[in-house]
Interface confidence: medium
């Protein structure tokens, strides 16, 4: 349905609070270096303009597209050229090229200082003094650091952030109440950002067919009682929502997400028995709840798939008539029967099935040719099963920190050209799979582990794309979305890599090490470990373990010393010399 004024339409649909929040997120995700006050000014101007259009949709400029209105507003920023360099050239373009240009300049790793958490009393005072500004600042700081954060979901995080302060700033022990809640929001927020980044990468790099296939598999696992047509409807609507959000169309995205939640709640009977408790909640909470809802129980009487997809004489006929629908039905039928498989595995099976039909339906005896297609699935299923089993055993044996270190060594040997901070970040996150998934029952391990690894490896791909240094990484990231994880798993020691020259500065430490948090200490040690492997890629596990144990002992000794700095100055060179000898 067309509206005379798109901006008035969205303002009325979303309401002022959500409209302003989403425009602030959109602007912060595009202009990530602009000061907060500048963004607030731009948002207020857009909001005032939207109100004039609500009053009179025929008023001047009210008929312009949102991209035109928002792009024009962003291009009024005086310091665009100095702050953003070539991004300023976007402003010379017309829509839709201008928006595409802004999208291409989104920076996944912006050069912004880490967020420092002030004292609880300072935060509570700021919250009470000006709640609106406090919450806007949260939206701004998260959005500029996570330029693909799912905007309507960020509004939900902001609502939880507000609720945490409202409750805890009244509490007797403010810190005990607030800090765990903020930690939880931070960790959930990082996970949400990374999951959304994979959705956007899927849409932008591999097209909406890839995203739709992912969504068919995931929604069929969640809603195994729903019919294929129902799952298709949800997939179509969900694809539109994420295409809009990933494309910077945040108002349309939030509006369509609300419509999708409404549709799901009005059609619970044909979707899932698990939606009821979500549907009683207010909008933001409802949409979040629906996205995270647990899998419904599988229908008890599901027949074998072989009858329709292997034994039937109509397989090639059905495939030829409507390939995507037939393959979609196959994926739906397979996924609803296998909540114990990762989505990526299900997509690999669908891909293998498609390849078999392409080959066999052109053969002299198609049925004879595809009769054993399900047998060919076995190695595809066993590979992630074995990987999860081996890595969970290793995690249980080593614990999280040492498991991360094992992965650091493994990945540094595979792709030593990748920057040390990226290897540390990615390997630490890969290592978190243990605590997240290995404690789960067998039937939930693989979907948890492999789909989480896909999200983490996408972060590696996104960072590497910005500064490409390894052909192996480029190959694994670009050849096939569903085979990214197996591609990285299959990489061996890079024999062509020329070891990095030893730099004593990299292994020089000071007394400030002693005041770091446990996490910061780990990152320092893991950074040193990566540098060691880059220097000696063929070092054995035992050699590296010996050096790291010595390192931990040296740091512990100096942090207990009276004159810490003197100890680091004296013991540091000894540690370096001993390490070089141990690795020679």
């Amino acid at each position: 349905d067309t509206h005379k004024s798109e901006v008035a339409h969205r303002f009325k649909d979303l309401g002022e609070e959500h409209f302003k929040g989403l425009v602030l997120v959109a602007f912060s995700q595009y202009l990530q270096q602009c000061p907060f006050e500048e963004h607030v000014k731009l948002v207020n101007e857009v909001t005032e303009f939207a109100k004039t259009c609500v009053a009179d949709e025929s008023a001047e400029n009210c008929d312009k597209s949102l991209h035109t209105l928002f792009g024009d507003k962003l291009c009024t920023v005086a310091t665009l050229r100095e702050t953003y360099g070539e991004m300023a050239d976007c402003c010379a373009k017309q829509e839709p090229e201008r928006n595409e240009c802004f999208l291409q300049h989104k920076d996944d790793n912006p050069n912004l200082p880490p967020l420092v958490r002030p004292e609880v009393d300072v935060m509570c005072t700021a919250f009470h003094d000006n709640e609106a500004t406090f919450l806007k600042k949260y939206l701004y700081e998260v959005a500029r650091r996570h330029p693909y954060f799912y905007a309507p979901e960020l509004l939900f995080f902001a609502a939880r952030y507000k609720a945490a302060f409202a409750e805890c700033c009244q509490a007797a022990d403010k810190a005990a109440c607030l800090l765990p809640k903020l930690d939880e929001l931070r960790d959930e927020g990082k996970a949400s950002s990374a999951k959304q980044r994979l959705k956007c990468a899927s849409l932008q790099k591999f097209g909406d067919r890839a995203f739709k296939a992912w969504a068919v598999a995931r929604l069929s696992q969640k809603f195994p009682k729903a019919e294929f047509a129902e799952v298709s409807k949800l997939v179509t609507d969900l694809t539109k929502v994420h295409t809009e959000c990933c494309h910077g169309d945040l108002l349309e995205c939030a509006d369509d997400r609300a419509d999708l939640a409404k549709y799901m709640c009005e059609n619970q009977d044909s979707i899932s028995s698990k939606l009821k408790e979500c549907c009683d909640k207010p909008l933001l909470e409802k949409s979040h709840c629906l996205a995270e809802v647990e899998n419904d129980e599988m229908p008890a009487d599901l027949p074998s798939l072989a009858a329709d997809y292997v034994e039937s004489k109509d397989v090639c006929k059905n495939y030829a008539e409507a390939k995507d629908v037939f393959l979609g039905m196959f994926l739906y039928e397979y996924a609803r029967r296998h909540p114990d498989y990762s989505v990526m595995l299900l997509l690999r099976l669908a891909k293998a099935y498609e390849a078999t039909l392409e080959k066999c339906c052109a053969a002299a005896d198609p049925h004879e040719c595809y009769a054993k297609v399900f047998d060919e699935f076995q190695p595809l299923v066993e590979e992630p099963q074995n990987l999860v089993k081996q890595n969970c055993e290793l995690f249980e044996q080593l614990g999280e920190y040492k498991f991360q270190n094992a992965l650091l060594v493994r990945y540094t040997k595979k792709v030593p050209q990748v920057s040390t901070p990226t290897l540390v970040e990615v390997s630490r996150n890969l290592g978190k799979v243990g605590a997240k998934c290995c404690k789960l029952p067998e039937a939930k391990r693989m979907p948890c582990a492999e789909d989480y690894l896909s999200v983490v490896l996408n972060r590696l791909c996104v960072l590497h794309e910005k500064t490409p240094v390894s052909e192996k990484v480029t190959k694994c990231c670009t050849e096939s979305l569903v085979n990214r994880r197996p591609c990285f798993s299959a990489l061996e020691l890079d024999e062509a890599y020329v070891p990095k020259a030893f730099n004593a500065e990299t292994f020089t430490f000071h007394a400030d090490m002693c005041t770091l948090s446990e996490k910061e200490k780990q990152v320092k040690k893991q950074t040193a470990l990566v540098e060691l492997v880059k220097h000696k890629p063929k070092a054995t596990k035992e050699q590296l373990k010996g050096v790291m144990d010595n390192f931990a002992a040296f740091v512990e000794k100096c942090c207990k010393a009276d004159d810490k700095e003197a100890c680091f100055a004296e013991e540091g060179p000894k540690f370096v010399a001993a390490s070089q000898a141990a690795l020679a």
Epitope: F228, A229, K233
Partner: nanobody
Framework: EVQLLESGGGLVQPGGSLRLSCAAS????????MLWVRQAPGKGLEWVSV????????YYADSVKGRFTISRDNSKNTLYLQMNSLRAEDTAVYYC????????????RGQGTLVTVSS
């Protein structure tokens, strides 16, 4: 009892158009996805198009994509198929049916309406 009654078929020249209708009764039409299938003389049933209960999304067999449009009016319990740029190979009996619960078969279909494309 489920009833589906197709109409609108007839003789048309290649390149011409026809609009088929299907009146549904005996079930809750607005919660059922529907489809059109066809059967050419001496051939098996061929899947043509599907429409979700809400009107979107729609799906088409590759052989009719871009020429046929499926639609529905839930207030009238009626399904439509607008057929443009008709070809000789579109000649068939066209049936409307409830979309399959599970696979590419269906639970109920009507008596059909004959479409003949010939000069």
């Amino acid at each position: 009892e489920v009833q589906l009654l197709e109409s609108g078929g007839g003789l048309v020249q290649p390149g011409g158009s026809l609009r088929l209708s299907c009146a549904a009764s005996g079930f809750t039409f607005d919660t059922s996805s529907m489809l059109w299938v066809r059967q050419a003389p001496g051939k098996g049933l061929e899947w043509v198009s599907v429409i979700h209960q809400s009107g979107t999304p729609t799906y088409y067999a590759d052989s009719v994509k871009g020429r046929f449009t499926i639609s529905r009016d839930n207030s009238k319990n009626t399904l439509y198929l607008q057929m443009n740029s008709l070809r000789a190979e579109d000649t068939a009996v066209y049936y409307c049916a409830k979309f399959p619960s599970r696979k590419m078969k269906f639970d109920y279909r009507g008596q059909g309406t004959l479409v003949t494309v010939s000069s």
